[in-house]
Interface confidence: low
């Protein structure tokens, strides 16, 4: 009986990488391409249809366009090899290779796609009022991860993690975690993105710097407060000048009334 074989029935590949899945079929002497049919499908998605010595791209599901191909040179070696480039999370699933060459047979191969939280971006900012540091780690990956914060002396710290969908790919998760802590210069902290499965952890090291620039949000506050403080300065200067010229009482009464009217009405009436 015509039987096809697979050397691997499970392939695990990283998001964005390439994979070549193989089905082997018996070839005696010279391969007759025109007697061979090869199909690669994933559930109801048609990926490859090789019939009458050529690949029919009209059949190919749009999600595999420009990314999936049958390696023709391998056919002569008795291998129906499907190559997928720029692997996406949606490519994960069960693939079927069906080969007809006199007899016919098929095999199923599972493709698993994972995306490690490898590129961890980090930020450290400080609250100028409380001097509390805010440490932030952000990364994209799949499946969902929890973020563990630890100090250099291995204490586990309590951070706040938010998970959203990535802008890059629908199934990809964007995980952001923040830790608010009172820290001193050169202290070291670690954020670890932990996914299910062995060796699925990715860690970033955050070192508290000697001096921190004012965070962007604080700079914005100064931009808004700046003109107001300037105006206040002008008002105080005018008040001081008028006081010197003996017209102090009218202005003072006016100002006192305005400044206190909201909070201390009783004073307003006493002074009037």
């Amino acid at each position: 009986a015509f039987t096809i074989t697979v050397s691997k029935d499970l392939y695990v590949v990283e998001y964005g990488g390439n994979v070549t899945m193989e089905c082997k079929f018996p070839v005696e002497k010279q391969l007759n391409l025109f007697a061979l049919i090869v199909y690669w499908e994933m559930e109801d998605k048609k990926i490859i249809q090789f019939v009458n010595g050529k690949e029919d791209l009209k059949v190919q599901h749009s999600s595999y366009s420009q990314r999936a191909q049958l390696l023709k040179d391998q056919l002569f070696l008795g291998k129906a090899a499907l190559q997928i480039t720029d692997v996406r999370l949606q490519d994960a699933g069960v693939y079927c290779c069906l080969i007809g060459y006199g007899g016919a047979d098929y095999k199923r191969i599972t493709l698993k796609v994972h995306a490690p939280y490898r590129n961890i971006s980090q930020r450290i900012s400080v609250d100028p009022v409380t001097s509390e540091h805010e440490l932030m780690c952000q990364a994209e990956g799949y499946p969902e991860a929890e973020v563990i914060w630890t100090s250099s002396d291995h204490r586990v710290l309590s951070g706040k993690t938010t998970i959203t969908n990535s802008n890059r790919e629908e199934k990809l998760f964007n995980v952001t975690s923040t830790l608010n802590i009172n820290a001193t210069a050169n202290e070291i902290f670690y954020c670890t993105f932990q996914r299910s499965g062995p060796e699925e952890n990715n860690t970033a090291e955050l070192v508290i710097p000697e001096r921190l620039p004012v965070p962007a949000s604080e700079r914005t506050h100064f931009m808004i407060l700046g003109p107001f403080l300037l105006l206040l300065g002008v008002v105080l200067a005018v008040t001081f000048c008028l006081k010197k010229h003996g017209r102090m009482m009218d202005v003072e009464k006016c100002c006192t009334r305005d400044r206190n009217s909201k909070k201390r009405n009783d004073i307003q009436f006493e002074e009037t």
Epitope: E43, K46, V51, N52, V94, C96, L98, T110
Partner: antibody, heavy 118, light 111 residues
Framework: QVQLKQSGPGLVQPSQSLSITCTIS????????VHWVRQSPGKGLEWLGV???????DYNAAFTSRLSINKDNSKSQVFFKMNSLQADDTAIYYC????????????WGTGTTVTVSS | DIVLTQSPASLAVSLGQRATISCRAS??????????MQWYQQKPGQPPKLLIF???NVKSGVPARFSGSGSGTDFSLNIHPVEEDDIAMYFC?????????FGGGTKLEIK
Amino acid sequence: QVQLKQSGPGLVQPSQSLSITCTISGFSLTSFGVHWVRQSPGKGLEWLGVIWSGGSTDYNAAFTSRLSINKDNSKSQVFFKMNSLQADDTAIYYCARGGGPDWYFDVWGTGTTVTVSS
Amino acid sequence: DIVLTQSPASLAVSLGQRATISCRASESVEYYGTSLMQWYQQKPGQPPKLLIFAASNVKSGVPARFSGSGSGTDFSLNIHPVEEDDIAMYFCQQSGKVPHTFGGGTKLEIK
């Protein structure tokens, strides 16, 4: 060896629903789709629907409104439910494994003979 | 839906001779160059059993005396030489378009 065993009632009252469980062995529901086909003397063989390995379903448009197919991969079971049965739904109901790229049915279940009668 | 018409409805053949069953589709079952037509054998009290898929591909384990041919809308199943064990009903099935549909069946008997 690959097997599909079916369990379900033999007699259903008109306007009631039919539930059949297809318990599989020798393969995984995460790798193969499972189709449902029925056979009656009056209408012959009719394809009803499929649940794909990934869990999504496709139904014959003639049955969409009253058919649902679900599964439990861990228990290796597929659940078939058809509502509002009438006398002309009397048939043998089969679950069958989707072969190759799910064009055909390479292994069939034992079959459940269903009679709709009061 | 695609309607499949099988002929003849019944067929009596002598042992060792050739049996030919036809199946005609109401429209093409071609799927980008491949005819998605299958053939099944069914014996009394048993579910159907797959013999041929994609018009001419014999399923692994099926005896070589079974063969399929045809394309587009016209297909045939050939059994040669016919054996006693081949007494059964034979059905064609298309999957070129959803829903999958079946022929009405051909009953094979021995003369």
